[in-house]
Interface confidence: low
């Protein structure tokens, strides 16, 4: 009679994280008697995967009853797969014997490759705000998947960024890896509503790419603009003096008016308008009873944003010369700032 | 004038090592992405490594990668190219050359230097 | 790496000749394709960035287009200064690659 031979038909079977992997083993003849055995990897280091006389294998299923006198198939299933299940498994015969059991014959190995998918991607950016014109940096890290194959892309809305690199590690084989990618952006005054996004694109994903995604509102600082004017109201020995701040992201804003270098009264930025590209617009005022002084007036609009250093704007207020044209600032209404005399 | 002026090429045996330089003028060195890309006698362009304009993030070919440093001192306007443990497929004719968008990537390059000829033979 | 491929290697060409040269990607590349010349002796020269953009003091009769994987470029009318090799080159993904070259040739 022929001599047994262990046959494994598959040489590799690729199954996605979670699923089952079936591994297919058949033998061509019963004799000699004894058990199989199904071990990842060959040599001394082998790892025993089942054994049909003994031991507690919950992950497999054989595919057949093995305990049937005339049953020649070895196949078995290992539920609930995951990257550290990747490696290459033989089946092995065994013949009887006393005390043990001796090693008969081994298939030729299956090779189980596990797709696993990315996790989704996280992206951060820079600990600190910094202004337009500046390069950042934002990172995206995805996690976990295999095999190493692994497409990103940057893009900052919608338009695609070539200024990255891009990392998967590790660089030898593993059960699964992870990528890593440093993209530059260059801001711009109207970044405080873009977006920047890393998108992942793997085999497992089937055409559906993951995106993680960073606000640059969070990453962005927009200096104020500051214009300083003058109009006269009421009556003709007022003057309302505006300091408007123009176009400054985020909100945080301190505004301090001064008179001749002295500090009159420091406010800050509650009720500000919404420009449509996210920046906020804020406007302060003075009344100032001219009649009340000889001298010129120097009055100087100092703003502190976002814990910057301030910023200032002065304005020479001449009492020899009222303004004789007639006008009206209905935005200062909406301030909350409080009408002041200089005394 | 905007001119990039590359030095240090020569005559150098395998395994050994030389540092290329290139001295730039004319425009604000520290406010562009500077580049190493060769060329093999007779062969095509081949990119060599890149660098940030404040030395942040630095990109190598593969072929180099852990071999060739690339750096730059924005205060002397000067980029450099350290090449160790050199190779026959090493000699090329070594051109520097400029990211053309201002704070941005090396996208495309303008200008570049004339070049300096490195050649590995023992 | 994304691959370029240019075609044809070389071309034999009259001066006031419409020339065309073309250069594929491996894989999308979006618009972030460049032209250099260079001519024997010399270093690179930008003609082209952006794959359609023309750089400063480059004659008009060079032209770029095409966007994804298949880009064009085109002098209208050759001029006997046109005479030399032309590379593209990617830059959306590290490693930045050149196409092999082509060639213009006087016939």
């Known amino acids: 009679e022929e001599e047994l031979q262990v046959i494994q038909p598959d040489k590799s079977v690729l199954v996605a994280a979670g699923e089952t992997a079936t591994l297919r083993c058949t033998a061509t003849s019963l004799i000699p008697v004894g058990p199989i055995q199904w071990f990842r990897g060959a040599g001394p280091g082998r790892e025993l995967i089942y054994n049909q006389k003994e031991g507690h294998f919950p992950r497999v299923t054989t595919v057949s009853d093995l305990t049937k006198r005339n049953n020649m198939d070895f196949s078995i299933r290992i539920g609930n797969i995951t990257p550290a299940d990747a490696g290459t498994y033989y089946c092995v015969k065994f013949r009887k014997g006393s005390p043990d059991d001796v090693e008969f014959k081994s298939g030729a190995g299956t090779e189980l490759s596990v797709r696993a998918k990315p996790s989704a991607p996280v992206v951060s950016g820079p600990a600190a705000r910094a202004t337009p014109q500046h390069t950042v940096s934002f990172t995206c890290e995805s996690h976990g998947f295999s095999p190493r194959d692994i497409t990103l892309k940057w893009f900052k809305n919608g338009n695609e960024l070539s200024d990255f690199q891009t990392n998967v590690d590790p660089v030898g084989e593993s059960v699964s890896y992870s990528i890593h990618s440093t993209a530059k952006v260059v801001l711009t005054r109207e970044d405080v509503h873009s977006q920047v996004i890393c998108e992942v694109a793997h085999v497992t994903l089937q055409g559906d790419p993951l995106r993680g995604t960073a606000n640059l509102s969070e990453t962005i600082r927009v200096p104020p603009t500051l214009e300083v004017t003058q109009q006269p109201v009421r009556a003709e020995n007022q003057v309302n003096v505006t300091c408007q701040v123009r176009k400054f992201y985020p909100q945080r804003l301190q505004l301090t008016w001064l008179e001749n270098g002295n500090v009159s009264r420091t406010e800050t930025a509650s009720t500000v308008t919404e420009n449509k590209d996210g920046t906020y617009n804020w406007m302060s005022w003075l009344l100032v009873n001219v009649s009340a002084h000889r001298d010129d007036v120097k009055l100087t609009c100092q703003v502190e944003h976002d814990g910057q250093p301030a910023v200032s704007k002065s304005h020479d207020l001449k009492v020899s010369a009222h303004p004789k044209e007639q006008g009206s600032n209905t935005a200062a209404e909406n301030t909350g700032s409080n009408e002041r005399n200089i005394y | 004038e905007v001119q990039l002026l590359e030095s240090g090429g020569g005559v150098v045996q395998p395994g050994r090592s030389l540092r290329l330089s290139c001295a730039a003028s004319g425009f604000t060195f520290s406010s562009y992405a500077m580049g190493w890309v060769r060329q093999a006698p007779g062969k095509g362009l081949e990119w060599v490594a890149v660098i940030w304009v404040d030395g942040s993030l630095k990109y190598y070919a593969d072929s180099v990668k852990g071999r060739f440093t690339i750096s730059r001192d924005n205060s002397k306007n000067t980029l450099y190219l350290q090449m160790n443990s050199l190779r026959a497929e090493d000699t090329a004719v070594y051109y520097c050359a400029t990211g053309r968008e201002t704070y941005s990537g090396p996208n495309w390059f303008d200008p570049w230097g004339q070049g300096t000829l490195v050649t590995v033979s023992s | 790496d994304i691959q370029m491929t240019q075609s044809p290697s070389s071309v034999s060409a009259s001066v006031g000749d419409r020339v065309t040269i073309t250069c594929r990607a491996s894989?999308?590349?979006?618009?972030?394709l460049a032209w250099y010349q260079q001519k024997p002796g010399k270093a690179p020269k930008l003609l082209i960035y952006a794959a359609s953009s023309l750089q400063s003091g480059v004659p008009s009769r060079f032209s770029g287009s095409g966007s994804g994987t298949d880009f064009t470029l085109t002098i209208s009318s050759l001029q006997p200064e046109d005479f030399a090799t032309y590379y593209c080159?990617?830059?959306?993904?590290?490693?930045?690659?050149f196409g092999g070259g082509t060639k213009v040739e006087i016939k």
């Open positions: 080159q990617q830059a959306i993904y590290f490693p930045i690659t």
């Open positions: 894989q999308g590349i979006s618009s972030w």
